[in-house]
Interface confidence: low
């Protein structure tokens, strides 16, 4: 997991590159990705989804490496939430920093466990007809 | 090396049905979108219809949606189209294409062949 | 439904020169500063190959002669110097909405 920051931190620098003006959503951030615990703890299983759903305006090299990591720390027969994140919205935007955000300064790194946990609140899903959970 | 098999593709009277299908190979198919591109005999492409990795998630254009049916059974790393319907606007030849992050469409099969004609 | 029109519909280079080929969408296609348009190759009884993602990103194995550029509704597709093996059609395609949508090709000729 270690070298979850260093990678999460090069794709945040290109991706500040590009947008600028959106800020950090901590709420987006703890609804998307926690679990009724307190705490909040998270698992592979459940950040995985995201760093999928940021798949498309990030660099193929980087996030396949983390998505890669946190493949590894996911138990074997544990279910993946697929998620919906609307597309063309300043919540996906603030979204995708934040997810970049929080695992650039490790503050997520070290709250991975081992252990499965209930799945996570789906904050951004949207079913609407024309949005792309995963386009960006 | 990414492979994409299609298979299915058939000559068929206006109004009836087909299933296509893909055998994919080469890759992690669990992990990556998938859709199904047209090229209609004039050499145009045409989307038409993307399904997300796990399935949960299917996406149509219009003159498509009810008629036609995108699955996947990843277990068997297989991709298929059911048609309905058909018209004779459907003839063309049908490729199955793997996505990469959903907004890029990255390897191509060869195709199957669809005609609809009375 | 975004509109691409591809221009010219055909061209004959001569090798080694280069070959601009215009993809304009009728709206943007950009988000969050990546242009969400991308370029393939066909060649004649194949099937369509990724040259450009995303604008501006070659796709692996593609030779660097092939670039791509472009932002909001204009996007051009440049291949220099030309070769025999670049003669095919090519495609543009915007993925910033569904349906996703093509254009209606370029035909490309070494003269």
């Known amino acids: 997991m270690l070298e979850l920051q260093p990678l999460s931190r090069g794709l945040l620098e290109d991706y500040q590159k590009k947008e600028t003006g959106v800020p950090e959503s901590n709420r987006t951030l703890l609804l998307c990705l926690t679990s009724d615990s307190q705490p909040p703890r998270l698992n592979s299983s459940a950040i995985l989804p995201y760093f999928r759903a940021i798949r498309p305006l990030s660099d193929k090299n980087i996030i396949d490496k983390i998505i890669e990591q946190l493949d590894k720390l996911k138990f074997q027969h544990e279910p993946e939430t697929e998620i919906s994140v609307p597309a063309d919205t300043f919540e996906c935007k603030s979204f995708i920093l934040t997810i970049l955000q929080q695992f650039s300064k490790g503050e997520l790194n070290s709250k991975l466990e081992g252990k499965p946990i209930p799945n996570p609140l789906l904050g951004l899903d949207s079913t609407r007809t024309g949005h792309h959970h995963h386009h960006h | 090396e990414v492979q994409l098999v299609e298979s299915g593709g058939d000559l068929v009277k206006p109004g009836g049905s087909l299933k296509l299908s893909c055998a994919a190979s080469?890759?992690?198919?669990?992990?990556?979108?998938m859709s199904w591109v047209r090229q209609t005999p004039d050499k145009r492409l045409e989307w038409v219809a993307t399904?997300?990795?796990?399935?949960?998630?299917?996406y149509y254009p219009d003159n498509i949606k009810g008629r036609f049916t995108i699955s996947r059974d990843n277990a068997k790393n297989t991709l298929y189209l059911q048609m309905s319907s058909l018209k004779s606007e459907d003839t063309a030849m049908y490729y199955c294409?793997?996505?990469?992050?959903?907004?890029?469409?990255?390897?191509w099969g060869q195709g199957t062949s669809v005609t609809v004609s009375s | 439904d975004i509109l691409l029109t591809q221009s010219p519909a055909s061209l004959a280079v001569s090798l080694g020169q280069r070959a601009i080929i215009s993809c304009k969408a009728s709206?943007?296609?950009?988000?969050?500063?990546?242009?969400?348009m991308h370029w393939y190759q066909q060649k004649p009884g194949q099937q369509p190959k990724l040259l450009i993602y995303?604008?501006?990103n070659l796709e692996a194995g593609v030779p660097t002669r092939f670039s791509g550029s472009g932002s909001r509704t204009d996007f051009t597709l440049n291949i220099h110097p030309v070769e025999e093996e670049d003669a095919a059609t090519y495609f543009c395609?915007?993925?910033?909405?569904?349906?996703?949508?093509f254009g209606g090709g370029t035909k490309l000729e070494i003269k």
């Open positions: 995303r604008a501006s």
């Open positions: 709206q943007s296609v950009s988000f969050a500063g990546t242009g969400l």
């Open positions: 294409v793997r996505g990469y992050g959903y907004d890029t469409m990255d390897y």
């Open positions: 399904i997300s990795y796990g399935g949960s998630y299917t």
């Open positions: 395609q915007q993925s910033r909405e569904y349906p996703w949508t």
């Open positions: 080469g890759f992690s198919f669990s992990n990556y979108g």
